[in-house]
Amino acid sequence: GAPGDAALPEPNVFLIFSHGLQGCLEAQGGQVRVTPACNTSLPAQRWKWVSRNRLFNLGTMQCLGTGWPGTNTTASLGMYECDREALNLRWHCRTLGDQLSLLLGARTSNISKPGTLERGDQTRSGQWRIYGSEEDLCALPYHEVYTIQGNSHGKPCTIPFKYDNQWFHGCTSTGREDGHLWCATTQDYGKDERWGFCPIKSNDCETFWDKDQLTDSCYQFNFQSTLSWREAWASCEQQGADLLSITEIHEQTYINGLLTGYSSTLWIGLNDLDTSGGWQWSDNSPLKYLNWESDQPDNPSEENCGVIRTESSGGWQNRDCSIALPYVCKKKPNATAEPTPPDRWANVKVECEPSWQP
């Protein structure tokens, strides 16, 4: 695409509409104004939340900001390079409307002239909405995208990022001949050279996946990543997958084969984070095969997430979910064959006597 364009669809792009001023927020020439001519195809009126609570404009490829610290003049509200220090570029979606009202004023005459609005009665933040809906400015938040491979240990993309003197507000294939989408995990790729591939949801197991030809299940071993269980789960989910579940001895054997030669402890989908009772797989597979190490699981109020360990030939332990570890994702591509009958195993709510653990 064009320089700086995200190669992925942009579901989280929106126009910012003021009921009080009856217009949309537009960035132009380093300044912002409210214009009555709302236009969803005009990049200068298209906004998105990006990393670190910043608001990015697709027309100027800059972030909304004010002088630092918080000077309350209309002139100080404007568009700035997203990596500018000594500026306030961070906004809370809930209070952004109040701040826009304060900084832009509320006089409705001459509203399409930048920088000429007088301070009038403040409109409430409730007067600022996503154009075309009654949703507030928190309705389309930024979602962190966890990287695969690369050299960032699974850390999320930094959006926007600068590469080859251009700003990118999403994953891009620019600079790659293989067409894979990637992002930088710090703001300036040229300075830090930290990057990773972006997760994609696909129905095949081509890139980044190992396929078990017997079961058609696909596995992704992120040995270089260091994420918490929650982040690892989110990374798998972003690829249309889930953390690894192991439901039979064949699968455990296959996994052990792929772990051969590694010394690692990796997050899998085992957890007891749901009150419905006991340990379960995050993909809702039945827990019908067990490979706990001896004396595991333990510490029920502190260690609620499961790992697989190469040191114990693929045995399972429970650990504190906040520990940063590598992880394994699993997905089953959409089968075109006859649908399999429902498994007679099922997760049911487990109630135990006081002296027993589910």
């Epitope: 789960w233 109020s301 906040s322």
Partner: antibody
Framework: EVQLVESGGGLVKPGGSLRLSCAAS????????MNWVRQAPGKGLEWVAN????????HSVESVKGRFTISRDNSKNSLYLQMNSLRAEDTAVYYC??????????WGQGTLVTVSS | SSELTQDPAVSVALGQTVRITCQGD??????ASWYQQKPGQAPVLVVY???NRPSGIPDRFSGSSSGNTASLTITGAQAEDEADYYC???????????FGGGTKVTVL
């Protein structure tokens, strides 16, 4: 059914002491870490202290360190909070809370501690 | 211990949707839990884990999370939903717990 019942609250003068108790039932008390959480009148919730299942590891918020001691008696399914050198800012409802997995899923009804001269 | 930041107050018209947000570093490692508290009562867990509700909590309550931000959404707010809402998560190692400052939800 899990139940937590606090007791021991009351009116005490600044510098005084109180001992709160929490009687637990309906679950394997010795397996769980336990917590005290407080709420000053009209204010938000504040975690105060916790104690690991075997009682050998305790943690507390900075403002009560050296004054409050959390303890437990697993044979009695009971949790305690010994509060010394009480200050006016310790006035609050004190809740006993049992953690689930990454959350505090069972709470008592609370006991009110008022520190006033 | 880490801090969790919430909006102090938010209002919603009866039957409309309201979203409460919570931000903090511990939310990168743990899912947020959300508690409802009415005057004179103990907090009640309403949403936890990915987007789970304890039994008895209506399905109009839902949760989501991304990065260091968690959200509680009440879809079709009812008069009885007027209360204070607190987010909560453990800090690393589950040695302490962080609470948000609370959000007062008013149903108009």
């Amino acid at each position: 059914e899990v139940q937590l019942v606090e007791s021991g609250g009351g009116l005490v003068k600044p510098g005084g002491s109180l001992r709160l108790s929490c009687a637990a039932s309906g679950f394997t008390f010795p397996s769980y870490a336990m917590n005290w959480v407080r709420q000053a009148p009209g204010k938000g919730l504040e975690w105060v202290a916790n104690i690991k299942p075997n009682g050998n590891e305790r943690h507390s918020v900075e403002s009560v360190k050296g004054r409050f001691t959390i303890s437990r008696d697993n044979s009695k399914n009971s949790l305690y909070l010994q509060m010394n050198s009480l200050r006016a800012e310790d006035t609050a409802v004190y809740y006993c809370a049992r953690p689930g997995a990454g959350r505090l899923d069972y709470w008592g009804q609370g006991t009110l501690v008022t520190v006033s001269s | 211990s880490s801090e969790l930041t919430q909006d102090p107050a938010v209002s919603v018209a009866l039957g409309q949707t309201v979203r409460i947000t919570c931000q903090g570093d511990s939310l990168r490692s743990y899912f947020a839990s959300w508690y409802q508290q009415k005057p004179g009562q103990a907090p009640v867990l309403v949403v936890y884990f990915k987007n789970n509700r304890p039994s008895g909590i209506p399905d109009r309550f839902s949760g989501s999370s991304s990065g260091n931000t968690a959200s509680l959404t009440i879809t079709g707010a009812q008069a009885e939903d007027e209360a204070d809402y607190y987010c909560n998560s453990p800090n690393s190692g589950v040695i302490s717990w962080a609470f948000g400052g609370g959000t007062k939800v008013t149903v108009l």
